[in-house]
Amino acid sequence: RTRSGSQLDGGLVLFSHRGTLDGGFRFRLSDGEHTSPGHFFRVTAQKQVLLSLKGSQTLTVCPGSVQPLSSQTLRASSSAGTDPQLLLYRVVRGPQLGRLFHAQQDSTGEALVNFTQAEVYAGNILYEHEMPPEPFWEAHDTLELQLSSPPARDVAATLAVAVSFEAACPQRPSHLWKNKGLWVPEGQRARITVAALDASNLLASVPSPQRSEHDVLFQVTQFPSRGQLLVSEEPLHAGQPHFLQSQLAAGQLVYAHGGGGTQQDGFHFRAHLQGPAGASVAGPQTSEAFAITVRDVNERPPQPQASVPLRLTRGSRAPISRAQLSVVDPDSAPGEIEYEVQRAPHNGFLSLVGGGLGPVTRFTQADVDSGRLAFVANGSSVAGIFQLSMSDGASPPLPMSLAVDILPSAIEVQLRAPLEVPQALGRSSLSQQQLRVVSDREEPEAAYRLIQGPQYGHLLVGGRPTSAFSQFQIDQGEVVFAFTNSSSSHDHFRVLALARGVNASAVVNVTVRALLHVWAGGPWPQGATLRLDPTVLDAGELANRTDSVPRFRLLEGPRHGRVVRVPRARTEPGGSQLVEQFTQQDLEDGRLGLEVGRPEGRAPGPAGDSLTLELWAQGVPPAVASLDFATEPYNAARPYSVALLSVPEAARTEAGKPESSTPTGEPGPMASSPEPAVAKGGFLSFLEANMFS
């Protein structure tokens, strides 16, 4: 079969695998005039890795709550038994009724974009439902995900989220839209409105066109013991125990307290959906209690005091004091002032000394005053807020908040790479590759102070030397290292990083990146001398930029061979001079050779070697560069991509014909390819470069 280069370059030639995993095909290459000898193209097939998704792919969430995704919900696996850390989900379309976030990150941050199966297993991926303004009974949300784990093909997944009042919710004991209870002054009456009791979410289960003809029937199953319920001024009693949501909405339900004390009161009820004119209708129902708190008429409500945020390090425990939570209440003892956690952050929990290890949701001012209440920072080092409600038991609850700022226990300055300064520029901006602070998360607010400055340069911000800068300035590319002394190819400086009260130091290494074009090409023949010229090493651009002749100094290598100056006259090889320094001009004049040696003490075969050079030019710092090359035993049939000044003696002898030998110093027509073919055009060009002379 014949295939053209344009077909190859156009991606039209496909390899279809069948049979064993290792194999390939033989081919010849022809340009119409010349034909190369046979070649073998090796192909290794990998077993196809398949991703699969198990789990219900449905999540049931209580209204207004946070629910972790679990392995029951979302469980990915691969046929190759891939590590769950490497099974990555990308959120293609996020939730509409809430948000997805990571437990270890600030819950107020941006929506989650990626997460792993391992994070699902750890319970760190959370869905938070946000309560809408309009009542609902059941709502449905979807998340579109893409599961990927190269080399397997991506798998699309849809996670269905059901938010329902039907579900048993520990954090929301009522199945109604509102069941907040009532505060009534002793001996007085108070209207029970939909602000306190509202079953309109049951009505929301009916399609809106029919909703107006439906109602919710409340049947009082246990009446208040210290007062009376009235609907449109008519008392409710065992013989008349019903009222409707429509009556509640119209403000017709009243509780009248009978006086004689401030004990708690309330009533129990059943509520169910009712069809038009009282017909039966299938729909939700609930049995609940409505709390009524009777308030002393002379009661003065407690006054919350200003709160100082609690600061503690990650993984530690700190007591909550009056600085964080206190109230002024002249007619209540500290033990009577109760706090209830309405919403807790994800960075830890409150615990009571002697109250078990788990989180507490209720405590008193006495617990705070005695130092019994503590916060345990078991989450990530982020700020969080407790939403609390506080009451003295005689006044309506007041909202309060407690801010907790978790500081990292330690920070680390991540140095991913030394700072590389382009040789001709002599300056470079620092980035996150050089300086980035992490604790249990990234610390974008980090600040840096120079504690040991660079020897050969300065750090600049806005063009001025500086000894302090921020992560933000680094990220914006505003922090620049500039060489001021052109005598060293490297430098370093030490910084102290500070993030949220924790510090760490680090050394940033600076290296100069040589402005040098290096091209070793294919393997070079052992025992031969090849010409070092600008096709191999070229500092021409540096010469232009600095208006000088760049100088090279050999620092190291080659291990097997040497760099020599080639004499102009045709003399014996012994006339070659060992070189330790040379210039760009020497390269351009073709005056340099590299004698490629054979590795000693082992069988002939391919090997690797290198030259380490220091490159100098006027007005710029020096730079260290290396020329890495591969070597192989000389193959007379093989075209080499560099000019050969001589070939091994053995090769000349083996040829046996005088005309096949090439005098040293004068490249023969067959011994080299004066212009190395650089592969630019894909597969075909690669073949041309390596298989044709």
Partner: antibody
């Protein structure tokens, strides 16, 4: 106390229409559905339909569909039931009844309508 | 439509004796949403409108003497007068309020033997 007072007896010719009224008092008129039930002489009770005084929505028994119209006037707390194309078998006592939850808790005194040529 | 059938059509019971009236619905009137039977009993005396006795099959309306009781579930229901009094002479109707049309039974005439 709750009272439903109906209009007086009527005699109608076949093919004519009748309109019976039911005036409510003693409760919030718009809170409770009003139903119409009729009883032919010596016969049982027959449900005709309901009206929601709040919304004006109605629901009629299939048998009376197209012939019956129930309306209300919230300003006077009155419900009306009109039956057209009268026949002799429409001779009956017509009751309005206030429903509460899922039963007829209060009834009007009834209106006798006689259809005779 | 749900059809209500009462038995017997008429019943004569001695004063002080127990009277039992049955009512059968053509389909269940038990609501799944609140577990209530949407079945009511009414008493009608000559020249008067009907009067509610029992709702939800077994709950006595306020002011109704406790000799009246209702029982049953689903499709079969019973009204019992434990000790018949002279003022109980009337026609008794069962009625379903499960869905429209809210049908009545044909009535049972109760007399004194």
């Amino acid at each position: 106390q709750v009272q439903l007072v109906q209009s007086g007896a009527e005699v109608k010719r076949p093919g004519a229409s009748m309109k019976v009224s039911c005036k409510a008092s003693g409760y919030t008129f718009t809170n409770y559905y009003i139903h119409w039930v009729r009883q032919a002489p010596g016969q049982g009770l027959e449900w005709m339909g309901w009206i929601n005084p709040n919304s004006g929505a109605t629901n009629y028994a299939q048998k009376f569909q197209g012939r019956v119209t129930m309306t209300r006037d919230t300003s006077t707390s009155t419900v009306y039931m009109e039956l057209s194309s009268l026949r002799s078998e429409d001779t009956a006592v017509y009751y309005c009844a206030k429903s509460w939850v899922s039963w007829f808790a209060s009834w009007g005194q009834g209106t006798l309508v006689t259809v005779s040529s | 439509d749900i059809v209500m059938t009462q038995s017997p059509d008429s019943l004569a019971v001695s004063l002080g004796e127990r009277a039992t009236i049955n009512c059968k619905s053509s389909q269940s009137v038990l609501s799944s949403s609140n577990n209530k039977n949407y079945l009511n009993w009414y008493q009608q005396k000559p020249g008067q409108p009907p009067k509610l006795l029992i709702y939800w099959a077994s709950t006595r309306e306020s002011g109704v003497p406790d000799r009246f009781s209702g029982s049953g579930s689903g499709t079969d229901f019973t009204l019992t007068i434990s000790s018949l009094q002279a003022e109980d002479v009337a026609v008794y109707y069962c009625q379903q309020h499960f869905n429209t049309p809210f049908a009545f039974g044909q009535g049972t005439k109760l007399e004194i033997k």
